[in-house]
């Protein structure tokens, strides 16, 4: 016999909730293998800046980003799967992830804010090897990607520490409209932007930590009302 | 060992068109920008034009817009300049170089070929 | 007129030293993006000499090194030899007018 009344209306929404969970991880690690074994990509590894090889952020960034959609993914079908299925075995296992989930995040977070220094000069790396590629590897598609998201997020346009060639490239192509590189010399600098975003703008990451947080507790509170629904209601 | 070799420069009349073509060797021609640069009778150098290694991004000096288009054939490995609506002051040797990423600056050119503009 | 301005002629007698500067401004070599150097020897096809400022690419002899201050730059050649009597190119690139600029030439003669 199944759940009934509020509890099933709790399966529901669960199951909903993970759902979307599940297809946003998909997407996240979806995007990550293609930036990782994409061809055009891959030359990164081999890149050289002058004479020295390039440093391996880019791949660090896509790696954190598989790791996360394969979480993302496994949790999501765990409270999916064991929603639908009224499993407490499955949502007890998804219970005890989202409780180290939550353990993760917060200790994240902690890290994070000790470490945003450092955080911030590894997403500016990240930035620079990504529009790098864009510009030695004109047909890289995923580096372009890369760095107009950074562009449209940001609301910026390369940096003061540009090369000639990708000052040019940047002003015909790769300027989000609106933006003028060349005026008043990079007042739209992206490294700016990503240290204003790690220092000015820290409580906007905050919120967004905040926001998952409570998502969270709010899915171990589901999961733990559904379990005990489906406990009572096999008792009957 | 590197080589760019210019041809296609000669004399035409102001108002005229001309092709110029750089082939190249001894480089991975297909993974390089290629640049042209021009230097008018004993004057000094100037750039012209720059293309990226697949072609999907190309530049001009102002002098030069709409009048010229730079374009590659990678299969060939060689470089083109199409010049049209030509002016006494195109005039020149025109230089076509490679262009370095890392160094970024003009690394190889050639011997180049010269255009003269004259009626 | 040139973006960069040179000296238009250089000279020295063999074994001196000759130093050719490079002025620009805040939008080209002042803004940070390097300077580098050509050597075009009479009738043939300018070769880099000096690039990022400083570097030498390999086959260039140590007797040939480049600086960078502000918004000039130089080039420096000791131990003159008869065989460097050419013209000599400084090259950034212009963030106002978004195109590689050239020196106007400095032509060095070695003189005796």
């Known amino acids: 016999m199944g759940v009934e009344g509020c509890t099933k209306c709790i399966k529901y929404l669960l199951f909903v909730f993970n759902f979307v969970f599940w297809l946003a991880g998909g997407v996240i690690l979806g995007v990550a293998l293609w930036l990782r074994h994409d061809p055009q990509t891959t030359n990164l590894l081999y890149l050289e800046l002058g004479d020295k090889p390039a440093p391996n952020t880019f791949y660090v960034g896509i790696y954190i980003l598989i790791a996360v959609g394969a979480v993302m993914m496994f949790v999501g079908f765990l409270g999916c799967y064991g929603a639908i299925q009224e499993s407490q075995c499955l949502l007890g296992t998804f219970f005890t992830c989202l409780v180290i989930l939550f353990a993760c995040e917060v200790a994240a977070g902690i890290w994070g804010f000790v470490n945003k220094d450092q955080i911030a000069k590894d997403v500016k790396q990240f930035y620079d090897q990504a529009l790098q590629q864009a510009v030695v590897d004109d047909d890289a598609n995923n580096a372009k990607a890369v760095v107009k998201t950074f562009h449209e997020t940001l609301d910026c346009c390369g940096s003061s520490t540009l090369t000639a060639l990708t000052t040019s490239v940047l002003k015909n192509n790769a300027c989000p409209s609106g933006s003028n590189i060349i005026s008043n010399l990079f007042k739209e600098d992206c490294h700016q932007k990503i240290d204003d975003l790690f220092s000015g703008k820290l409580y906007l990451i905050g919120i967004a930590a905040i926001v998952v947080a409570v998502i969270m507790i709010f899915e171990m509170i589901l999961s733990m009302v559904l379990c005990c629904g489906i406990r009572n209601s096999s008792v009957y | 060992e590197v080589q760019l070799l210019e041809s296609g420069g000669g004399l035409v009349q102001p108002g005229g068109s001309l092709r110029l073509s750089c082939a190249a060797s001894?480089?991975?021609?297909?993974?390089?920008?290629m640049s042209w640069v021009r230097q008018a009778p004993g004057k000094g150098l100037e750039w012209v034009s720059y293309?990226?290694?697949?072609?999907?991004?190309?530049d001009y000096a102002d002098t030069v817009k709409g009048r010229f288009t730079i374009s590659r054939d990678n299969s060939k490995n060689t470089l083109y300049l199409q010049m049209n609506s030509l002016r006494a002051e195109d005039t020149a040797v025109y230089y076509c170089?490679?262009?370095?990423?890392?160094?970024?600056?003009?690394?190889?050119w050639g011997q180049g070929t010269l255009v003269t503009v004259s009626s | 007129q040139s973006v960069l301005t040179q000296p238009p002629s250089a000279s020295g007698t063999p074994g001196q030293r000759v130093t050719i500067s490079c002025t620009g401004s805040?939008?080209?070599?002042?803004?940070?993006?390097?300077t580098h150097w050509y050597q075009q020897l009479p009738g043939t096809a300018p070769k880099l000499l000096i690039y990022g400022n400083s570097n030498r690419p390999s086959g260039v002899p140590d007797r040939f090194s480049g600086s960078k201050s502000g918004t000039s730059a130089s080039l420096a050649i000791s131990g003159l030899r008869t065989e460097d009597e050419a013209d000599y190119y400084c090259?950034?690139?212009?963030?106002?007018?978004?195109?590689?600029?050239f020196g106007g030439g400095t032509k060095l003669t070695v003189l005796g």
């Open positions: 293309i990226s290694s697949s072609s999907s991004y190309t």
């Open positions: 090259q950034s690139y212009d963030t106002n007018l978004s195109v590689w600029v």
């Open positions: 170089a490679s262009y370095s990423y890392g160094r970024d600056s003009f690394d190889y």
């Open positions: 805040t939008s080209n070599i002042g803004a940070g993006y390097d």
């Open positions: 001894g480089f991975t021609f297909s993974s390089n920008y």
